[in-house]
């Protein structure tokens, strides 16, 4: 049975040309974290592998960084980065866990973080 | 004590193909990522590829990237790497090694003794 | 990719001397730097790994020290079987790299 939750930095915004934190955390479950994907609609950001450490796909090499711990740093945003963002989490019993997380990237200086929420 | 041995290195002409084994004993093959760590005469070290525990995961270097894949079977405690479309720059020796867990801080810790791979025509 | 950028490329030492050799990484990598020693003809051999801990077996003379991307390895007294390359290594982000190598001679 999956007892884990995901709880997201949830629905954010930003400012053109800056950087955002994408961070997601797995809790409520002793199940093994294998491996943590990172994807944007259905396009591979990233891959943190606890074997092999992480993967940046090769299209998002100059604008993606790892970290700060399972987290993604998106770097030079532009109003085409707005969109939907999902933190897959594979583990060991349970299985697969997916976060989400909405990015609204904002031409002005208006951008604010949004509330956490959680994702059973 | 921890056993890496390499074999199936050898003399192969540009564009050929060889398959590298590396036989493991002493350790519990199946708890260990594994990787490919390859020098050129009188160069420094090149990583090459690695391996999941499980074999579900592998990464390549850009220069091997389409042209190398690397295996594992743990049922036989053996890493492989198949070589194809060689070129003269893969000239060099190709050791197998373990990989401590990314998790646990990383550091290739037991290395084998090496295969060399010579690509001349 | 990450470039490890290690200096001296060489350097010349005598028996009891402090050796210290510096590794810079081209971006950030946390504490994930590896150093290894190899002599020729063998294989390489891993000295520190996660930027400060001693691999198992590894005299107590050999200590690494950094975080993001400065690092250092040090020789606190330069042994006869010391003399060597040196090399450190980022396990941070695929594809993992290595540093061009520090020749550690007799003086």
């Known amino acids: 049975m999956m007892t884990g939750t995901i709880e997201t930095t949830g629905n954010i915004s930003a400012e053109k040309g800056g950087s955002i934190i994408l961070q997601c955390h797995l809790s409520s479950t002793t199940a093994q974290v294998t491996q943590v994907n990172w994807e944007q609609q259905d396009q591979l950001l990233a891959i943190c592998n606890a074997d092999l450490g992480w993967h940046i796909s090769p299209s998002f090499k100059d604008r993606v960084a790892p970290g700060p711990g399972l987290g993604l740093t998106l770097q030079s945003l532009t109003v085409n980065d707005t969109g939907e963002y999902f933190c897959i989490y594979h583990t060991y019993p349970d299985g697969t866990y997916t976060g989400r997380i909405f990015l609204e990237v904002l031409e002005s200086s208006v951008a604010e973080h949004g509330a956490r929420f959680q994702i059973p | 004590e921890v056993q890496l041995l390499e074999s199936g290195g050898g003399l192969v002409q540009p564009g050929g193909s060889l398959r590298l084994s590396c036989a493991a004993s002493?350790?519990?093959?199946?708890?260990?990522?594994m990787t490919w760590v390859r020098q050129a005469p009188g160069k420094g070290l090149e990583w090459v590829s690695g391996i999941s525990r499980s074999g579900g995961s592998t990464y390549y270097a850009d220069s091997v990237k389409g042209r190398f894949t690397i295996s594992r079977d743990n049922s036989k405690n053996t890493l492989y790497l198949q070589m194809n479309s060689l070129r003269a720059e893969d000239t060099a020796v190709y050791y197998c090694?373990?990989?401590?867990?990314?998790?646990?801080?990383?550091?290739?810790?037991?290395w084998g003794q090496g295969t060399l791979v010579t690509v001349s025509s | 990719d990450i470039q490890m950028t290690q200096s001296p490329s060489s350097l010349s030492a005598s028996v009891g001397d402090r050796v210290t050799i510096t590794c810079r990484a081209s971006?950030?990598?946390?504490?994930?730097l590896n150093w290894y020693q190899q002599k020729p003809g063998k294989a390489p051999k891993l000295l520190i790994y996660?930027?400060?801990s001693l691999q198992g077996g590894v005299p107590s003379r050999f200590s690494g020290s950094g975080s993001g991307t400065d690092f250092t390895l040090t020789i606190s007294s330069l042994q006869p079987e010391d003399f060597a390359t040196y090399y450190c290594q980022q396990n941070y982000i695929t594809p993992l790299t290595f540093g061009g190598g520090t020749k550690v001679e007799i003086k």
């Open positions: 002493g350790l519990t093959f199946s708890n260990y990522a």
């Open positions: 971006q950030y990598i946390s504490t994930y």
């Open positions: 996660a930027a400060s």
């Open positions: 090694a373990t990989l401590r867990l990314y998790s646990s801080g990383g550091g290739i810790d037991y």
